[in-house]
C-alpha cells in the first residue's frame, strides 16, 4: 500500500534549490530501483518533478497560493520491467500554506459618494471594501481593519465594516461642497507589520433647502409707457438663493400695493427671475405712479429647517406710467347711421366725434377714407365730423355702405386713429311691381268658361316694411269684350280665367293679355305686363296636342284682340 | 538518438553456439531492461529473455532456459545472447529490444543465424 | 503461458477503410486499471516497431489514425483509413506475467 500523507509546501519559497514537497512511497518497494515511480496531474512534470527511482517530490518552480491553493496529483508505482502497477493509481493532494504576501485591495481606486448636507451625526455616506487575496481561514493575513487617513473631523469610519458616515455636525453645502477622505485598509487586524492599501472616497454634500430667497434691496424702480399692452414686461427682479436645484427655486407675487390689479409677476424658470409685466390698459391722465410689494418664496421647504425664519423675502416694486402721445379717441367704437334712398346730394346723416385724450387736448380733423368710399359717395365735415351725402342713392343697388373716416390730430398729423361707419340706405317705394317671369300660356279649343289657365306672380325691387301688397288687373282698353278675365288671389298672385265655351284657333290663334300689376305702398307705383294665351288642339285630357305654327315664329305679328 | 546496432549474420554448424551482440547508445545503458526476442523464416516473433544491465538480473522463457546465456557489458553498453546446442529450428532472425514497462520501444536491425550442416 | 490468439490471420481493405484486428488473451492481462497489452507493426525485412502500448496509448511519431481499445481479455487495434504504407503484420504482445507472449500476427493488405 501507498504510505504518504497530504503534502504541504510554504508559498513562495526563495530558496537557489528546487524545494522538497515530500516522498512517494510503496511498501512494495524493495529498493533495488526495479519500481518506477509516475507523477501525473496538476502541474506534474512542470511544477512539481519526481525522482521516479525514490518517489522523492520537488516543486520546481515559486507557487503562488492565491494563484493556485491546491494541486490534485496523481502517483503511480510501476514495475520497470513489465510495466505492472505495484500499487493502484492513487490521488494525492499538496496543499500551498499561506503568508502574507498579498495587501488588502479596494474594489474600487476611487469612490463617489454623496450626502445630504446638514445631515445628523453617523449618517450613512458610503461603504468601501478591501479584499485580501490571502488564506482567510489561516492566521490574519486577510484579516482587514479600516482606519481613516484623511477626512476629519468631517467624515469616520468603522473599522470591521468599512461603513463612512457623517462626524460632523451642520455640515453645510454652501461652506463646503467637496471632500476627499482617504480610507486604509490594512491585513493583520491592523496589527504592526500587517500590509495596507488606501482608497480616496470623493464625498459632495448635496443641497438641502436650508437658504430662504433673499432680494439683494428693498425697492426697485420701473418706468413703463401708458401705451404698453396687457402682457409687456416692464422690469425683472432677482432675489438670490444660496441652494442649488429645486431648493433654489423661486416663485414671485404681488402681495400688496394699489398696482395689485393693474400689473402681473411671472416667474422666469430659467433666470429665476420675477419679471413685472403690464396686466390691464395704464393711462397717464388717470394715474402716474403704482407702488407693488412683490414677494419671493421656496416653492419647495423642508419644515426641519423652518426654524431658521421664513423662506419668503419681499420687495416694494415702485411703476412710473410715462405719458404717450395718444391718437384721438371716437366716441365709438363703430357708428351705425341710416339714410333715406331718396336723399338729395349734401342730405347730412349723422355725426362723429373724437378726441385727444391728451392733457394737451389737440384739436382734431375728419377726413373719409378714399379707399372705403372709391365713389365718393359721402363727404364729412373736417372740422365738426357731420357725414352728408355727395351722390345719389339706391337701396336696390346697395343696403350698406361700410366706410372708415379718419382723426387726425392738427397739430401732430402722425397721431390719427380710425372708425368705422355702417351706412344703412332706408327703402323708399321708388320701383313698380312686375311679372315674375315671362308668362306664355296655352288655351285648349274647347275649354270651358272660367276655366283657370295661367297663375301670375309678381316682383318688386322695393323691400317695403310692412311687405308688398300686388292687385292685379286687365289694363283698361282690354277689359271690356275680352275674351279672357283676370281674377287677383289678393296673395300678391293673380289668375287668368277663360271666359268662353270654345275658342277656334283658325279664327284667333292667339291673344294678348295687357295686365296691370300696382303696389299698395307710397307713392304707388304700377306696370303693364303682356301674358301670350295661344289656342291649342288638346286630347280629352286637357293635354295640348298642336297649336298654330306661327304663334311660335312670329307672336309680336299676331293679333292682339284678347 | 537512441540506436542498438547488432553483429552481423552468422553461419553455424548443428550443435554448435553462436553469441550475437548488441550495441546500445543514445541513452543510460543500465537504465533499462534488454530483451532478445527471434523470428524464424516465415513465422512470428518470440520472446526468449532479458536482462537488467544494472543488476544483472535475467529473466529466460522456458524453452530455451537450458540454452541461452543473456549478458552485459556495462563498460561497453554492449549487450550479448548466447545460443549453444544449435539445431536447425534456430535457425531465425535474432532481435535485440530495449524494454521499457513491459513494451519494446527501440529494436535492433537483427542478426540472422543460419544452421546448417 | 499466457496464449495470444490474433484474428484474422490476414485481412484485405481498400484504401481510406478502416481496418480492425482483435487479439484475445487466454486470461486477463489488466492490473489495477493498467492493461498490459501492447501492438507492433512490421514490414518485411525490418524489425518490428512499437505503435500503441498499454491497450490505448499511441506512442509517439505514430499517425494517429493507429487507436487500441479493450481490457482484461479482449483488444483491438484500429487503423481508421488505412493508407498504402500500413500494409504490413501487425503483432500483439502481453507482459502481464513470464513469458511474454506475442500473438500469431495478422497480415494486412489492400483490396
Known amino acids: 500500500s501507498w504510505m504518504w500523507n497530504q503534502f504541504f509546501l510554504l508559498e513562495e519559497y526563495t530558496g537557489s534549490d528546487y524545494q522538497y514537497v515530500g516522498k512517494l512511497h510503496s511498501d512494495q518497494d524493495r529498493g533495488d530501483g526495479s519500481l518506477k515511480y509516475i507523477l501525473s496531474g496538476d502541474g506534474a512534470g512542470d511544477l512539481f518533478i519526481i525522482n521516479e527511482n525514490t518517489g522523492d517530490i520537488q516543486a520546481t518552480k515559486r507557487l503562488d497560493r492565491e494563484e493556485k491553493p491546491v494541486y490534485i496529483l496523481r502517483a503511480q508505482a510501476i514495475n520497470r520491467r513489465t510495466g505492472r502497477p505495484v500499487e493502484p493509481e492513487s490521488e494525492f493532494i499538496i496543499k500551498i500554506h499561506d503568508i502574507n504576501d498579498n495587501e488588502p485591495i479596494f474594489t474600487k481606486e476611487v469612490y463617489t459618494a454623496t450626502v445630504p448636507e446638514m445631515s445628523d451625526v453617523g449618517t450613512f455616506v458610503v461603504q468601501v471594501t478591501a479584499t485580501d487575496a490571502d488564506d482567510p481561514t489561516y492566521g490574519n493575513s486577510a484579516k482587514v481593519v479600516y482606519s481613516i487617513l484623511q477626512g476629519q473631523p468631517y467624515f469616520s469610519v468603522e473599522s470591521e465594516t468599512g461603513i463612512i458616515k457623517t462626524a460632523l455636525l451642520n455640515m453645510d453645502r454652501e461652506n463646503r461642497e467637496q471632500y476627499q477622505v482617504v480610507i486604509q485598509a490594512k491585513d493583520m487586524g491592523g496589527q504592526m507589520g500587517g500590509l495596507s492599501g488606501t482608497t480616496t472616497v470623493n464625498i459632495t454634500l448635496t443641497d438641502v433647502n436650508d437658504n430662504p430667497p433673499r432680494f439683494p434691496q428693498s425697492t426697485y424702480q420701473f418706468k413703463t409707457p401708458e401705451s404698453s399692452p396687457p402682457g409687456t414686461p416692464i422690469g425683472r427682479i432677482k432675489a438670490s438663493d444660496a441652494d442649488v436645484g429645486e431648493n433654489a427655486e423661486i416663485e414671485y407675487s404681488i402681495t400688496d400695493g394699489e398696482g395689485l390689479d393693474m400689473f402681473d409677476v411671472i416667474t422666469d424658470q430659467e433666470t429665476q427671475e420675477g419679471i413685472i409685466t403690464v396686466k390691464k390698459l395704464l393711462d397717464f391722465e388717470k394715474k402716474k405712479v403704482y407702488t407693488l410689494k412683490v414677494e419671493a418664496s421656496n416653492p419647495y421647504v423642508e419644515p426641519r429647517f423652518l426654524y431658521l425664519g421664513p423662506f419668503k423675502d419681499s420687495a416694494t416694486v415702485r411703476i412710473v406710467v410715462e405719458d404717450v402721445d395718444e391718437p384721438p379717441v371716437f366716441s365709438k367704437l363703430a357708428y351705425i347711421l341710416q339714410i333715406r334712398e331718396d336723399a338729395q346730394i349734401n342730405t347730412t346723416i349723422g355725426s362723429v366725434t373724437a378726441q385727444d385724450p391728451d392733457a394737451a387736448r389737440n384739436p382734431v380733423k375728419y377726413s373719409v377714407d378714399r379707399h372705403t368710399d372709391m365713389d365718393r359717395i359721402f363727404n364729412i365735415d373736417s372740422g365738426n365730423g357731420s357725414i352728408f351725402t355727395s351722390k345719389l342713392l339706391d337701396r336696390e343697388t346697395l343696403l350698406w355702405h361700410n366706410i372708415t373716416v379718419i382723426a387726425t390730430e392738427i397739430n401732430n398729423p402722425k397721431q390719427s386713429s380710425r372708425v368705422p361707419l355702417y351706412i344703412k340706405v332706408l327703402d323708399v317705394n321708388d320701383n313698380a311691381p312686375e311679372f315674375a317671369e315671362f308668362y306664355e300660356t296655352f288655351v285648349c279649343e274647347k275649354a270651358k268658361a272660367d276655366q283657370l289657365i295661367q297663375t301670375l306672380h309678381a316682383v318688386d325691387k322695393d323691400d317695403p316694411y310692412s311687405g308688398h301688397q300686388f292687385s292685379f288687373s286687365l289694363a283698361p282698353e282690354a277689359a271690356s269684350g275680352s275674351n279672357f278675365t283676370i281674377q287677383d288671389n289678393k296673395d300678391n298672385t293673380a289668375g287668368i280665367l277663360t271666359r268662353k265655351n270654345g275658342y277656334n284657333r283658325h279664327e284667333m290663334s292667339t291673344y294678348l293679355l295687357p295686365v296691370v300689376i300696382s303696389d299698395n305702398d307710397y307713392p304707388v307705383q304700377s306696370s303693364t305686363g303682356t301674358v301670350t294665351v295661344r289656342v291649342c288642339a288638346c286630347d280629352h285630357h286637357g293635354n295640348m296636342q298642336s297649336c298654330h305654327a306661327e304663334a311660335l315664329i312670329h307672336p309680336t305679328g299676331l293679333s292682339t284682340g284678347a | 538518438e537512441v540506436q542498438l546496432v547488432q553483429s552481423g549474420a552468422e553461419v553455424k554448424k548443428p550443435g554448435s553456439s553462436v553469441k550475437v551482440s548488441c550495441k546500445a547508445s543514445?541513452?543510460?545503458?543500465?537504465?533499462?531492461?534488454m530483451h532478445w526476442v527471434r523470428q524464424a523464416p516465415g513465422q512470428g516473433l518470440e520472446w526468449m529473455g532479458d536482462?537488467?544491465?544494472?543488476?544483472?538480473?535475467?529473466h529466460y522463457t522456458q524453452k530455451f532456459k537450458d540454452r541461452v546465456t543473456i549478458t552485459v557489458d556495462k563498460s561497453t553498453s554492449t549487450a550479448y545472447m548466447e545460443l549453444s546446442s544449435l539445431r536447425s529450428e534456430d535457425t531465425a532472425v535474432y532481435y535485440c529490444?530495449?524494454?521499457?514497462?513491459?513494451?519494446?520501444?527501440?529494436w535492433g536491425q537483427g542478426t540472422t543465424v543460419t544452421v546448417s550442416s | 503461458d499466457i496464449v495470444m490468439t490474433q484474428s484474422p490471420d490476414s485481412l484485405a481493405v481498400s484504401l481510406g477503410e478502416r481496418a480492425t484486428i482483435n487479439c484475445r488473451a487466454s486470461?486477463?492481462?489488466?492490473?489495477?486499471?493498467?492493461?498490459?497489452m501492447h501492438w507492433y507493426q512490421q514490414k518485411p525485412g525490418q524489425p518490428p516497431k512499437l505503435l500503441i502500448y498499454?491497450?490505448?496509448n499511441l506512442e509517439s511519431g505514430v499517425p494517429d489514425r493507429f487507436s487500441g481499445s479493450g481490457s482484461e481479455t479482449d483488444f483491438t487495434l484500429t487503423i481508421s483509413s488505412l493508407q498504402a504504407e500500413d500494409v504490413a503484420v501487425y503483432y500483439c504482445?502481453?507482459?502481464?506475467?513470464?513469458?511474454?507472449?506475442f500473438g500469431g500476427g495478422t497480415k494486412v493488405e489492400i483490396k
Open positions: 486470461e486477463s492481462v489488466s492490473i489495477h486499471g493498467t492493461h498490459l
Open positions: 504482445q502481453q507482459s502481464f506475467e513470464d513469458p511474454w507472449t
Open positions: 498499454a491497450a490505448s
Open positions: 536482462i537488467d544491465p544494472s543488476h544483472s538480473e535475467t
Open positions: 529490444a530495449r524494454g521499457d514497462l513491459g513494451r519494446f520501444d527501440y
Open positions: 543514445g541513452y543510460t545503458f543500465s537504465n533499462y531492461w
